[in-house]
């Protein structure tokens, strides 16, 4: 699934209107696809292909449907009880739920290795030592040089999902 | 990045409530998603219950819909998960979880602070 959710990202808080369905909470709360009305009598339809809600709530908002990033394909549409999927275009990948953008995947493994997995759209090549057979991932570093992670650039304008 | 601190915890007999708290230091928590996930021994960390620090509300797993609750105190800065009529099923570590921005919300990996963890077990 792919963008991430920040405050902008929820829908806002808003009176039904008039064609949202309505239904009473069970024990306080909403099933998926809905949301709590501001009186909590009252459980509101999330709009279709608009927002969403996954899980049982009360939660006065539901949340806005992810629109892909470009290097993305949509692997399924949002409904009101479920995201829209997005995966990494081939060639590229981003660990799941990640909330790095899509990276480039290796074209090849640093010498004395080799390759033992491809590069899929939530991983990289695998690569692993010719005599050892222990894995190698992420980039290759030049020789000497310091490995660090840091963490990738969030995705365009925070576009939202769940 | 915010530092999580839990406590509560412990050994309770199924049908008793607990209370676990979060407190969160490093910075004001205005916006940040926060989330409660589980690991019982062998399994995967799983999604309890997740809400916005500064929002009312929260969203809960069906094994847990009824029974838990999560709320906030912002004087004290911490997040509670109360926890009603506990069932031996629900033995595991309890984690709380923070993030300015997340992808998908009922996912471990969407989290980047993370509290030490605390142990709960329900005696039948």
């Known amino acids: 699934e792919s963008a991430l959710i920040t405050q902008q990202d929820l829908a806002p808080q808003q009176r039904a209107a008039p064609q949202q369905k309505r239904s009473s909470p069970s024990e306080g709360l909403c099933p998926p696809g809905h949301h709590i009305s501001e009186d909590g009598r009252d459980c509101i339809s999330c709009k279709y292909g608009q927002d969403y809600s996954t899980h049982w709530n009360d939660l006065l908002f539901c949340l806005r449907c992810t629109r892909c990033d470009s290097g993305e394909v949509e692997l399924s549409p949002c409904t009101t009880t479920r995201n829209t999927v997005c995966q990494c275009e081939e060639g590229t990948f981003r660990e799941e739920d990640s909330p790095e953008m899509c990276r480039k995947c290796r074209t090849g493994c640093p010498r004395g290795m080799v390759k033992v997995g491809d590069c899929t759209p939530w991983s990289d090549i695998e690569c692993v030592h010719k005599e050892s057979g222990t894995k190698h991932s992420g980039e290759v570093p030049a020789v000497e040089e310091t490995v660090t992670s840091s963490p990738g650039t969030p995705a365009s304008p925070c576009s939202l999902s769940g | 990045e915010v530092q999580l601190v839990q406590s509560g915890g412990g050994l309770v007999q199924a049908g008793d409530s607990l209370r676990l708290s979060c407190a969160a230091s490093?910075?004001?928590?205005?916006?940040?998603?926060m989330a409660w996930f589980r690991q019982a021994p062998g399994k995967e960390r799983e999604f309890v219950t997740y809400g916005i620090w500064d929002r009312a509300g929260a969203a809960y797993a069906d094994s847990v819909k009824g029974r838990f609750t999560m709320s906030r105190d912002n004087a004290k800065n911490t997040v509670y998960l109360q926890m009603n009529n506990l069932k031996t099923e629900d033995t595991a570590v309890y984690y709380c979880?923070?993030?300015?921005?997340?992808?998908?919300?009922?996912?471990?990996?969407?989290?980047?602070?993370w509290g030490q963890g605390t142990q709960v077990t329900v005696s039948s």
């Open positions: 490093g910075r004001a928590l205005t916006g940040y998603h």
């Open positions: 979880a923070a993030s300015m921005a997340v992808r998908t919300y009922y996912s471990p990996r969407s989290y980047d602070s």
